[in-house]
Interface confidence: low
Amino acid sequence: TTELTEEKYEYKEGQTLEVKCDYALEKYANSRKAWQKMEGKMPKILAKTERPSENSHPVQVGRITLEDYPDHGLLQVRMTNLQVEDSGLYQCVIYQHPKESHVLFNPICLVVTKGSSGTPGSSENSTQNVYRTPSTTAKALGPRYTSPRTVTQAPPESTVVVSTPGSEINLTNVTDIIRVPVFN
């Protein structure tokens, strides 16, 4: 099977993760969206939107908030008060069935570490934002996957922008391609 290239981001405990996932609104405006984490080889759905989606009607599951803007093809994910145990691989997906999802982006490997006292960025109000935009599908022997384009690392205490080009990826079996824990 083909493995997705994951991108690694480091956060301190207490920080908030903000992720924006664009999707093709013509295809997926009325679809449910989900935020998933890999546990072993199996994706675990942590939160999913209702159907039909309503603009700016947030779905909250614990520390995770999903806000779908179907008129604009935008899913916003927020994970607050990050903990060490949140480390892993995450993805935005179009949720169609527990065993069939359209994965929108390369997985992001989240690494949450304990912040030493006085370390900038260790407070709950410190947030790093990740922009995720649909990826161009690349031909592979296994399931279609994306290759990363640009990762811009801003200075400490700043923010991170991740962007990948093109249009959404269609993956029929998420378990074939995602190996490690995920985060967005």
């Epitope: 908030t16 664009d22 093809g73 927020r78 935009t133 811009t152 922008v161 080009p165």
Partner: antibody, heavy 116, light 105 residues
């Protein structure tokens, strides 16, 4: 209807700071991102940064990191931007905008003039 | 940052003309948004996510494109369309094109 109403024009000396406001109405303030964009006289549009009023989290253009500060008061549905260490090239109209995938509503703008 | 280059920078046209403005990105972006600005006014959203008309925008405006090349088309110019047009991308740090000024011939 959705409205973003910005504070009035400001004249500042080089090195000073300016704080402007953007009062939102007609929608749930915490559901949308507020962006700030500026436009120097006769020039194009330049993105400064954004704030999520619900969480207070911010994201800045690298050029403005450390010099612009975005805040939001959810009790009054008002977003604020403070720009410090003003220089003459900061003379511009500053707009607040509401963002989803694009900036669908804009304030009328606040003209900031920096002159000695 | 992704640079956006609009072409042409200025354009003279007549009422009823079909006008095309292009926006070229320095690297691939997912979508392009377009704004219209008239002198002394705030910009107004015309098209979002490449081809979707914003609320209240006439159907003579249309957008297309993908990757690095995007187009805004006005099928039949009306007097109120003379303005400056900006493209805008959000596939990373947000950037705008330098603007295209559409003037009456």
């Amino acid at each position: 209807q959705v409205q973003l109403v910005q504070s009035g024009a400001e004249v500042k000396k080089p090195g000073a700071s300016v704080k402007m406001s953007c009062k939102a109405s007609g929608y749930t303030f915490t559901d949308y991102v507020i962006n700030w964009v500026r436009q120097a006289p006769g020039q194009g549009l330049e993105w400064i940064g954004e704030i999520y009023p619900g969480s207070g989290s911010t994201f800045y253009a690298q050029k403005f990191q450390g010099r612009a500060t975005l805040t939001a008061d959810t009790s009054t549905s008002t977003a604020y931007m403070e720009v410090s260490s003003l220089r003459s090239e900061d003379t511009a109209v500053y707009y607040c905008t509401r963002r989803m995938a694009a900036m669908d509503y804009w304030g009328q703008g606040t003209l900031v003039t920096v002159s000695s | 940052d992704i640079q956006l280059t609009q072409s042409p920078s200025s354009l003279s046209a007549s009422v009823g003309d079909r006008v095309t403005i292009t926006c070229s990105a320095s690297s691939s972006v997912s979508y392009m948004h377009w704004y219209q600005q008239k002198p002394g006014k705030a910009p107004k959203l015309l098209l979002y996510t490449t081809s979707n008309l914003a609320s209240g925008v006439p159907s003579r405006f249309s957008g297309s494109g993908s990757g690095t090349d995007y187009t805004l088309t006005i099928s039949s110019l009306q007097p109120e369309d003379f303005a400056t047009y900006y493209c805008h991308q959000w596939s990373g740090y947000p950037t705008f094109g330098q603007g295209t000024k559409l003037e009456i011939k």
